[in-house]
């Protein structure tokens, strides 16, 4: 007789998830010098402790702790960059510059990326059927703790100067409800954090507007300057022309504003 | 430039108290998971006791009921209150420092000695 099995608003656990996780820790790891000292299979084995067993609305940060102090990685404070709605464009760009650092650059973020995960309270069972959703379920979901949680120690972590790619496309070109927005702006510490420069990503071909100017991007300004950070605002006009320049710097057509 | 000294060391008899004190400067010490680890020599360091930064507290099995780790935020500081002491915790006693992308840092260590 088929147990009965909760079903939750959002799509189910990714399918292999536990060796997509796996195999990510070992590129990774392979990869990069600094973090060939981690044992994968622990890694793996403290993500799974995070949410197997447990019920997937009554996840904590504490839960993920384990996994936290295993994928422990310096990062240049002061070459951190945040994003909000337009992650591709911010993972080219840090391709490019290596120098520079997304959240998904770091190991924990490259194990979790474009990943859904979840249990069942009480199986050892991982949910391929569905998991929940963070407004239809709950906000206490594997997957969104975990980002709540990594999205916090990676702000704290910010010094100097701290960009952010927003996405100008969108009607909220700044949304408080964002990772960015509720967790990583909050999280910037005044004592290391000097300023934080906003790089607003245009969409059309056309658009020659100021969105440094919009409403949402003042809003933020606002909650940035209460903190004691500065705020530094510039349009980004021509997002193909500007990792372009990244790449090639020298270029003539680099001198005039992108 | 980052500094854990570690403080409160010294000769205790078996059942007595020691108070072991650990002053950070040079980070945001409320930001960091700090830990308490102790060495004797030839074997590796051991987690005595850790505090989240959100303030959970994890003990080695061999210490609960008889450590209790604290922390003191404003005074950046972080404490190991030790009673019921026996000769099996004499070692010298590091003071950690963890944050996942902040970085990890270790006192320079103080000895306990437990002898009568």
């Known amino acids: 007789v088929p147990r009965w099995r909760q079903q939750w608003s959002g799509p189910g656990t990714t399918k292999r998830f536990p060796e997509t996780v796996l195999a990510r820790c070992v590129k990774y790891t392979e990869i990069h010098p600094e973090m060939r000292h981690v044992d994968c299979q622990s890694v793996w084995d403290a993500f799974k402790g995070a949410f197997i067993s447990k019920h997937p609305c009554n996840i904590t940060e504490e839960d993920y702790q384990p996994l936290m102090k295993l994928g422990t990685q310096t990062v240049p404070c002061n070459k951190i960059l945040l994003w909000s709605r337009i992650k591709d464009l911010a993972h080219q760009f840090t391709q490019v510059q290596r120098d520079m650092f997304t959240l998904e650059d770091t190991l924990l973020g490259y194990l979790a990326d474009d990943l859904t995960w979840c249990g069942e309270f009480n199986t050892s069972k991982i949910n391929y059927q569905s998991c929940p959703d963070w407004r239809k379920d709950c906000s206490n979901n594997p997957v969104s703790v975990f980002w709540k949680t990594v999205s916090r120690r990676f702000a704290e972590a910010a010094c100097d100067v701290v960009h952010v790619m927003l996405n100008g496309s969108r009607s909220k070109i700044f949304d408080k409800n964002s990772t960015f927005g509720s967790v990583e702006v909050h999280n910037l510490q005044p004592e290391k954090v000097q300023t934080l420069e906003a790089w607003v990503i245009h969409g059309g071909r056309e658009d020659s507007r100021d969105l440094c100017q919009d409403p949402t991007i003042k809003e933020l300004e606002s909650i940035i300057s209460k903190r004691n950070i500065q705020f530094s605002c510039k349009n980004i006009y021509r997002p193909d022309k500007f990792l372009q320049c990244v790449k090639n710097p020298e270029d003539s057509s680099c001198t005039s504003e992108i | 430039q980052v500094q854990l000294q570690e403080s409160g060391g010294g000769l205790v008899q078996p059942g007595g108290s020691l108070r072991l004190s650990c002053a950070a400067s040079?980070?945001?010490?409320?930001?960091?998971?700090m830990g308490w680890y102790r060495q004797t020599p030839g074997k590796q360091r051991e987690l005595v006791a850790e505090?989240?930064?959100?303030?959970?507290?994890n003990y080695a099995d061999s210490v609960k009921g008889r450590f209790t780790i604290s922390r003191d935020n404003a005074e950046n500081t972080v404490s190991l209150q030790m009673n019921s002491l026996k000769s099996g915790d004499t070692a010298v006693y590091y003071c950690?420092?963890?944050?996942?992308?902040?970085?990890?840092?270790w006192g320079q260590g103080t000895q306990v000695t437990v002898s009568s």
């Open positions: 950690n420092a963890d944050h996942t992308f902040a970085g990890v840092y």
């Open positions: 040079g980070i945001i010490l409320r930001l960091y998971d």
């Open positions: 505090i989240t930064s959100g303030g959970s507290t």
